[in-house]
Interface confidence: low
């Protein structure tokens, strides 16, 4: 009753904060400056309220802190006098999702700020091309994602729905494989994975080039170009050339845009052009032998895109070799 002359109660405000799994976040809360500051951060679930962090009488009070928050929370102590009651929250887990309430009391008022913390995860997905016996498959895979993403496939820019989805992780984060059987198809395919909470999208695009027929000891040029629609100029990416043989992939060349370094794993392999413009990653394979027949895969990948280009090379015996036999 004594306090009522000085004390006003301000209703609750609400804010949404989106964090990423394993990263740190600040849950914001501000108040009008006053003396005798008391701060209580609490987490509310369907059944209970848990103490996250408390401050009163000029220092942090962690005696009643719930163990799940031990060594993971702190306030900006030097800024409390300026009206900053924000909570610094380390190493987010999906279990941290939910409603956080910040109660701030001063000599003249009390406020309650409500922060809804949503935690998302989106580890860079991959697009893989696999051959199993006589069948060919495209797999869009995301190792860790939350909440469930939207996965869409397109064939020649037309949406298609017939894909086989596998998901692990019942509560999240989820690991998701979406597989498409592309046996015998010459179409181009695109897979998009979107996490709408984090507003993050990844796209994988697969293109099969026309088969190349070459003679023994000739050279072959394998095209692979970066499409500007997909990659922004300052985006880091990597280029991997590999060969598919009996379902196993062996790397032939590797390029990193950040360092502009190329590593060749096959001496007969070289770039078609100098990589000055960093957009044409076509390759030359010289001195062809019969055993060079097969599928060659160019993979250009960034955090947001994967472009896969497949070439089928058929090497035939040269006339001299044929007449020798």
């Amino acid at each position: 009753i004594f306090l009522s002359a000085f004390f006003t109660y301000v209703p609750m405000n609400e804010q949404i904060i989106i964090g990423r799994l394993g990263e740190d976040i600040i849950l914001p809360s501000s108040f009008e400056r006053g003396s005798e500051v008391v701060i209580h951060w609490k987490y509310q679930d369907s059944y209970n309220s848990y103490n996250v962090h408390s401050y009163y009488k000029g220092s942090g009070r962690l005696e009643s802190q719930d163990t799940r928050y031990a060594n993971r929370t702190s306030l900006f102590y030097n800024e409390i006098q300026n009206g900053n009651a924000s909570l610094f929250f380390r190493r987010l887990s999906l279990l941290d999702e939910g409603i956080y309430t910040c109660y701030v009391g001063t000599a003249i008022q009390a406020i309650t700020n409500k922060v809804v913390l949503k935690v998302g995860v989106f580890l860079t997905p991959m697009m893989k091309y696999e051959k199993r016996n006589t069948n060919s498959f495209l797999i869009c895979n995301v190792l860790s994602v939350y909440p469930r993403p939207i996965i869409t496939w397109k064939m020649d820019n037309t949406p298609i729905s017939e894909n086989n989805m596998q998901e692990t992780g019942s509560l999240g984060p989820f690991s998701i494989n979406s597989t498409l059987n592309i046996t015998g198809s010459n179409s181009s395919y695109e897979c998009t994975i979107e996490n709408s909470l984090l507003k993050q999208t990844w796209t994988g695009r697969w293109t099969m080039k026309d088969g190349l027929h070459k003679m023994q000891s000739e050279h072959v040029s394998l095209s692979c170009e970066l499409v500007n629609d997909y990659f922004s100029p300052n985006q880091d990416f990597k280029v991997t050339w590999s060969r598919m043989e009996s379902g196993i992939s062996s790397i032939l060349a590797y390029y990193l845009s950040s360092s502009q370094n190329t590593t060749f794993y096959e001496s007969r392999f070289s770039w078609n052009k100098e990589l000055k413009n960093q957009s044409d990653f076509s390759m030359n394979l010289t001195d062809l032998s019969l055993s060079d027949s097969g599928e060659y895969l160019c993979n250009i990948s960034s955090d947001e895109y994967t472009l896969l280009t497949i070439h089928t090379v058929h090497v035939e015996p040269s006339q001299e070799t044929a007449s020798d036999n």
Partner: antibody, heavy 120, light 107 residues
């Protein structure tokens, strides 16, 4: 197919209350954010409120904050809008709309709307 | 809150015309913009999302472009069925907002 059916509209006096409902079917209701959007006669669209898929968060347009309350019952596939202290400027067709996904996005599906008239 | 300014508010055009509607955001919204078509007495219909992606079933004469703060909706060849009102909507922030609308009427 997805269906959203609003009900509860009508004529009400200024200062009184009204409760709108939206019955959803044809999709997993608990996976999607739900919104109320209104349109005054002859005017444009105005977003009113959202409730997240799991009910943990509600956001309101400044024009209705403190007067309107959005709620949902995921077991019954229903969305409600409790409107208190109604004003003449709240007169509009109220649409319920389904978010594209679980977070704030665009609206793929809309109800047919229910008319609320605030008049003395 | 992010404000969306649409122009023009009314547009008179003929069948076969190329029509462009502009939407400007008060701050950058990346590509988080949708376009809707609405006919009198009906609910809005989604045309474009993520600034330029065409919603399934929407005719290809509709296209969207832009990012950041400037966006456009283009109808390449206006058809009789296209006379309607059009709205942009941002969903970059967690309070969505619509533009004021553009009414496309017969000249």
């Amino acid at each position: 197919q997805v269906q959203l059916v609003e009900s509860g509209g009508g004529v009400v006096q200024p200062g009184r209350s009204l409760r709108l409902s939206c019955a959803a079917s044809g999709f997993t209701f608990s996976n999607y954010g739900m919104h109320w959007v209104r349109q005054a006669p002859g005017k444009g669209l105005e977003w009113v409120a959202v409730i997240w898929y799991d009910g943990t968060n509600k956001n309101y347009a400044d024009s209705v904050k403190g007067r309107f309350t959005i709620s949902r019952d995921n077991s019954k596939n229903t969305l409600d809008l409790q409107m208190n202290s109604l004003r003449a400027e709240d007169t509009a067709v109220y649409f319920c709309a389904r978010d594209r996904n679980t977070a704030m996005d665009y609206f793929v599906y809309w109800g047919q709307g229910t008319l609320v008239t605030v008049s003395s | 809150d992010i404000q969306m300014t649409q122009s023009p508010s009314t547009l008179s055009a003929s069948v076969g015309d190329r029509v462009t509607i502009t939407c400007r955001a008060s701050q950058s919204i990346s590509s988080w913009l949708a376009w809707y078509q609405q006919k009198p007495g009906k609910a809005p219909k989604l045309l474009i999302y993520k600034a330029s992606s065409l919603e399934s079933g929407v005719p290809s004469r509709f296209s969207g472009s832009g990012s950041g703060t400037e966006f456009t909706l283009t109808i390449s060849s206006l058809q009789p069925d296209d006379f309607a009102s059009y709205y942009c909507q941002q969903y970059n922030s967690y309070s969505v907002t619509f533009g004021g609308g553009t009414k496309v009427e017969i000249k």
